[in-house]
């Protein structure tokens, strides 16, 4: 019988008492085969973290800073359940640390040196650790003691709880630096009052502070937020302009064998029986013998953290950067305006080889990082292990939902000023063999389908979106008799047609021979009835243009397109017979890397782009013999986006809506994780 006991870790007598009450009350409402609670008492949160890592306990609830400690080796714990605040309809699991300034003050984030600062308190998250962690490498050396470096960075501060004797500048705006509400500038409201009164130039608080202190929109409009990209935004745009997004209070467990499903089952049942306004005799979110025992008293319930989410993703790049800077205290030799090398994310073996050649030829401007799937690459860019990659529109959508931004677009048509004119897009088409003359868009049920990969634009999002509108369910593996859609579940009928060997079968990378545009067309040639690809795929792989044995004797005339009106047309008539227009592939990166990625890629394409005529000995960035490695092989240049610099603007309203509709059918664990951070 599987052990269904969750060993909860308590850090004080009062917590242990509440834990025992939790255990007893759960016993009274949960059947004997359901989850149960056992209590383990430790002296501190760090001891609890170690106990869970050592399998002496299973769960504890932690503040963000401790979630970071729990994640570090050798602990390797992960977030499994989040407390939420506010209402069930609009649950808040995170708050945003922000830098608030007066509207007319005219300076940016990179101009804070010499300004006067207001902090909630020394060592507090939004008021100190996050802003000072992010500013750490701009502080004057020596950076230890930290208080002295901060005092020398700002021209005056109020940092309640600081030592006013040793660091008088930190108490200059609030004599004495009192560590309670007796100090009018203490805490969130106090730090904001310090700014409001004109004592300070910037207040480091959380996003809700300004709303709690200024009920009137006209008053709030006198303030702005400083963004990390050295711009400003209105105070209600905190989701797009903050220093960090911070989880409030989180249950952690072991990454391996951590009982995360059992913990959720327990807490979900606990909130049903003993959550807000549920029971008189025991309340999960109440602490009669103290404050915030086991869970925060202000919590309203629990939400399951998506399984794909590790602590780094949960805490977010900015928060991890800030805390790491403070803990490790390491900075680059001397901050320069030079761009660091761009770490390109390469999918599996073949892309890695091309990336390595690029790295060698770039003489250090490009470095390479590998991942097995596109989603793994996106996750690596999110957490700073990689910086950039070029993505199909479907993945631009996921990357955008995960906070990444498009920076340059692939262009496929030769034009005089290619780099200045991003194209409208390419056409997503459905290709069939001419010989299968009875096949139309209206009778695809039961046929064999070939897709570039799950989640990609021409191969999946567009055709499956159209199909979903017809069949109103997500069981595409039942609609087609079999197929190859790399990235599907291995036991799905949509992996049956794939050709990869062993573990590579149906993998969404080049180890699966039927992956990508060329792969999906090959699948049609060898096994399938219909291939969902781009309009250039057939001409690029017929007439001897692809020398591979399977393709070298193919003729474009042997293939036709399915039109949405039930007719068929020759391949060259794609403009009048396509499923939809697809946004071009685009390079994505983190916001903080946008300028450098843009600059370095433009240099790189001038050296290795379409202007290179002989690719037999020279490195060519946009060539890989029909394999579309790193970039599509038909890329002519990477074009500026001008004002289309967010994923919504880049993809366009219509496509975003189409993918949004298909979200119900999404199997993307990354998309689930990212929408948890930003619904």
């Amino acid at each position: 019988v599987p052990d269904k006991t969750v060993r909860w870790c308590a850090v004080s007598e009062h917590e242990a008492t509440k834990c025992q009450s939790f255990r007893d009350h759960m016993k009274s409402v949960i059947p004997s085969d359901g989850p149960s609670v056992a209590c383990v008492k430790k002296a501190s949160y760090l001891d609890c973290i170690r106990a869970i890592a050592a399998n002496e306990a299973d769960a504890v609830t932690l503040d963000a800073g401790l979630v970071y400690d729990a994640y570090l080796a050798p602990n390797n714990l992960k977030p499994v359940v989040a407390e939420f605040y506010g209402s069930k309809e609009d649950p808040q699991t995170f708050y945003y640390a922000v830098a608030v300034v007066k509207k007319d003050s005219g300076f940016q984030m990179n101009q804070l040196r010499g300004k006067k600062s207001c902090h909630t308190g020394l060592g507090r998250s939004a008021g100190w650790n996050i802003p000072i962690g992010l500013l750490y490498c701009d502080l004057p050396e020596p950076r230890k003691p930290l208080e002295k470096a901060v005092a020398n960075f700002f021209s005056g501060s109020c940092a309640p709880c600081a030592d006013g004797t040793d660091f008088p500048q930190l108490c200059q705006l609030c004599p004495g630096c009192g560590c309670s509400t007796l100090n009018q500038y203490f805490g969130y409201s106090g730090a904001f009052k310090c700014l409001k009164d004109g004592a300070g130039d910037v207040a480091f608080v959380k996003h809700s502070t300004i709303f709690e202190n200024l009920a009137n929109k006209a008053d709030r409009d006198q303030y702005e937020l400083l963004c990390l990209d050295n711009t400003r935004k209105p105070v209600d745009e905190y989701k797009d302009c903050h220093l960090a997004q911070v989880p409030s209070h989180t249950v952690v467990a072991r990454s391996m064998g951590g009982k995360e499903d059992l913990i959720w089952e327990l807490l979900n049942q606990a909130q049903e029986h003993f959550g807000k306004d549920k029971s008189k005799e025991f309340q999960l979110f109440s602490s009669p013998h103290g404050k915030d025992l086991l869970f925060k008293d202000s919590a309203h319930g629990f939400l399951k953290v998506p399984p794909r989410m590790d602590a780094k993703m949960y805490l977010g790049y900015e928060y991890v950067t800030a805390i790491r800077n403070l803990r490790e205290g390491t900075c680059p030799e001397a901050p320069t305006d030079e761009c660091k090398p761009v770490k390109w994310c390469a999918l599996s073996h073949h892309e890695r080889l091309k990336c390595d050649e690029w790295s060698v030829n770039s003489v250090g401007k490009i470095e390479c990082v590998s991942a097995e799937t596109t989603e793994d690459c996106i996750a690596k860019i999110m957490n700073g292990e990689a910086d950039a990659m070029s993505l199909d529109g479907g993945f631009v959508y996921i990357a955008g939902k995960c906070g990444l931004v498009p920076v340059l677009a692939e262009n496929y048509n030769k034009s005089d000023n290619c780099e200045d004119t991003p194209e409208a897009g390419y056409f997503a088409i459905a290709v069939v063999k001419k010989s299968a003359s009875d096949l139309t868009w209206d009778n695809l049920k039961g046929k064999k389908s070939c897709h570039t990969a799950v989640g990609r634009t021409a191969g999946w999002n567009i055709p499956m979106g159209l199909l979903y509108n017809k069949i109103n369910h997500c069981r595409f593996d039942e609609f087609f008799s079999e197929g190859c859609a790399p990235g599907s579940k291995k036991d799905s009928s949509l992996c049956k047609l794939c050709m990869g060997s062993g573990l590579n079968l149906c993998e969404p990378n080049n180890k699966e021979g039927y992956y990508g545009y060329t792969g999906a067309f090959r699948c049609l040639v060898e096994k399938g009835d219909v291939a969902f690809v781009k309009h250039q795929t057939v001409p690029q792989n017929t007439g001897g243009k692809n020398p591979d044995p399977w393709a070298k004797n193919l003729n474009e005339k042997d293939y036709e397109l399915l039109c949405l009106d039930g007719t068929r047309k020759p391949v060259e008539e794609y403009a009048n017979c396509h499923l939809a227009r697809a946004p071009n592939h685009a390079v994505v990166t983190r916001k903080d890397k946008e300028a450098c990625v843009h600059k370095i890629l433009r240099q790189q394409q001038h050296l290795f782009g379409s202007n290179v005529t002989d690719c037999s000995g020279n490195f060519c960035l946009f060539r890989s013999e029909t394999k579309d490695l790193l970039f599509r092989d038909d890329t002519v240049c990477l074009a500026k986006l001008h004002d289309r610099n967010t994923y919504e603007k880049y993809l366009g309203e219509e496509y975003v809506k189409a993918v949004g509709n298909l979200r119900k059918c999404s199997t993307s664990s990354l998309l689930e994780a990212c929408t948890f951070r930003r619904p």
């Epitope: 030829n361 890989s624 013999e625 490695l629």
Partner: nanobody, 117 residues
Framework: EVQLVESGGGLVQPGGSLRLSCAAS????????MAWYRQAPGKGLELVSG???????NYRDSVKGRFTISRDNSKNTLYLQMNSLRAEDTAVYYC???????????WGQGTLVTVSS
């Protein structure tokens, strides 16, 4: 058909030196970017160093200042001079010719370098 034959590996003490060679035939050696890779037991393949047709070189951080890549186009041979060897340099070393464009995998049999006292 491209053929790459690596040689020069062996057992060496920490702090010692070795010079690896890679003879290429059937390759457009003189105009290709060439590189040395290595694979330690139980680990993935990693780029050690590369050299372009014009002689520009690139090294992974852990070997910078200790290893030197060079090429002799007249002999169709690539070299890797390895000094101040460390235990973590133990691996099978392979050379590759990128002219094959990444997906016709041309790899030699490799040459084993063991750094141990």
């Amino acid at each position: 058909e491209v053929q790459l034959v690596e040689s020069g590996g062996g057992l060496v003490q920490p702090g010692g030196s070795l010079r690896l060679s890679c003879a290429a035939s059937g390759s457009i050696f003189s105009i290709a970017t060439m590189a040395w890779y290595r694979q330690a037991p139980g680990k993935g393949l990693e780029l050690v160093s590369g050299i372009t047709r014009s002689g520009s070189t690139n090294y992974r951080d852990s070997v910078k200042g200790r290893f030197t890549i060079s090429r002799d186009n007249s002999k169709n041979t690539l070299y890797l001079q390895m000094n101040s060897l460390r235990a973590e340099d133990t691996a099978v070393y392979y050379c590759t010719d990128y002219s094959s464009r990444y997906y016709h995998d041309y790899w030699g049999q490799g040459t084993l370098v063991t750094v141990s006292s």
